[in-house]
Interface confidence: low
Amino acid sequence: LPAQVAFTPYAPEPGSTCRLREYYDQTAQMCCSKCSPGQHAKVFCTKTSDTVCDSCEDSTYTQLWNWVPECLSCGSRCSSDQVETQACTREQNRICTCRPGWYCALSKQEGCRLCAPLRKCRPGFGVARPGTETSDVVCKPCAPGTFSNTTSSTDICRPHQICNVVAIPGNASMDAVCTSTSPTRSMAPGAVHLPQPVSTRSQHTQPTPEPSTAPSTSFLLPMGPSPPAEGSTGD
């Protein structure tokens, strides 16, 4: 004879466990049904009646099969420096991640609790280590022979252009200016004569992104005053 399928609630055989999507209720001493994701246990099972499940109420969720009396609260709405990458539904929590130009200064189990703007390296400093989702930009002074003339969270130090004759030597925050001895092509009347470098700049250059117009936001956590990191802007 085939084994009879037990319907919940049922008393498990001694030494055996309840089946998948069931739990053992200590009070009833029975195997009872779990509630599906998006639901919670409204009434616990007894020896004669199974678990009564109910939908999670507004702004709450359960992600797993469960027998919790109340659903978990979704996190608060994403702040202005964040993007909602996963909405709050009855089956999943809201996930907030930092928007472009920001990094996660304080993470939580899923998503980010506190975003901060990526550091901008000021002129004379370039990006040594770019920002990631969870780490800030690291700036470094431009080494001799390189420069950065931008305030940017992405620009690296670039090599000075090489001139036949140098008009103004380059420094950490300015490219070298070349003296043009003989124009390589004729100029239109009234046109400005741009210096012609011998060689084009090396392949290290990166396009400078448009500056983001990020609204200034106050941090959610108290942060004491601290001097800006070397090479970063103090805005």
Epitope: D54, R77, S80, C88
Partner: antibody, heavy 116, light 110 residues
Amino acid sequence: QSLEESGGRLVTPGTPLTLTCTVSGIDLSTYAMIWVRQAPGKGLEYIGFIRPGGSAWYASWAKGRFTISKTSTTVDREITSPTTEDTATYFCATYDTYGYGDTRLWGPGTLVTVSS
Amino acid sequence: AYDMTQTPASVEVAVGGTVTIKCQASESIFSYLAWYQQKPGQRPKLLIYYASTLASGVPSRFKGSGSGTQFTLTISGVECADAATYYCQQGYDFSAVDNVFGGGTEVVVK
């Protein structure tokens, strides 16, 4: 889908009064309800709201003065000790907390007059 | 927290004209703002939600804009039926606030 307030009447100051919002075609286990009042010739004033699970939140000025509770088909708002300043039309409205924070469905309102 | 300041308190406009009502939140409510129309003796009627989305059945002459703390309701091609009081309402936080509504703007149509 409709809402209807009831219980509005003339009361003397200090006499507790309960207003009831009866819903039809609305599942109060998925919608929150908000109470708003409007004194004669004045603007809309938020009193508080009750979530589907039964927890209530109040405007800062309304805490301790009002109590909001619910059953499966009604939402009650009790004013514990009315004063003449509580004379107003009282509205209930649905508030979908999965939505955009707007109240789409309003009851017609019930008038409460507090006078000695 | 989240105090809503609405201006002007009253405005007069000719039929066919345009009226602009502004609503300012004391702190950012992102786009969680609704606009309502209320006529004397009637319940408020939802016009616009989520700052700029027209509610069902509302004529396209009503337009909402803004986000963060500054919001605007514009009624263009005003009709006599638009004479009413208009309210803004923040829907971002209903807990521990004084009022979720602006003070209202009375629109008088000449």
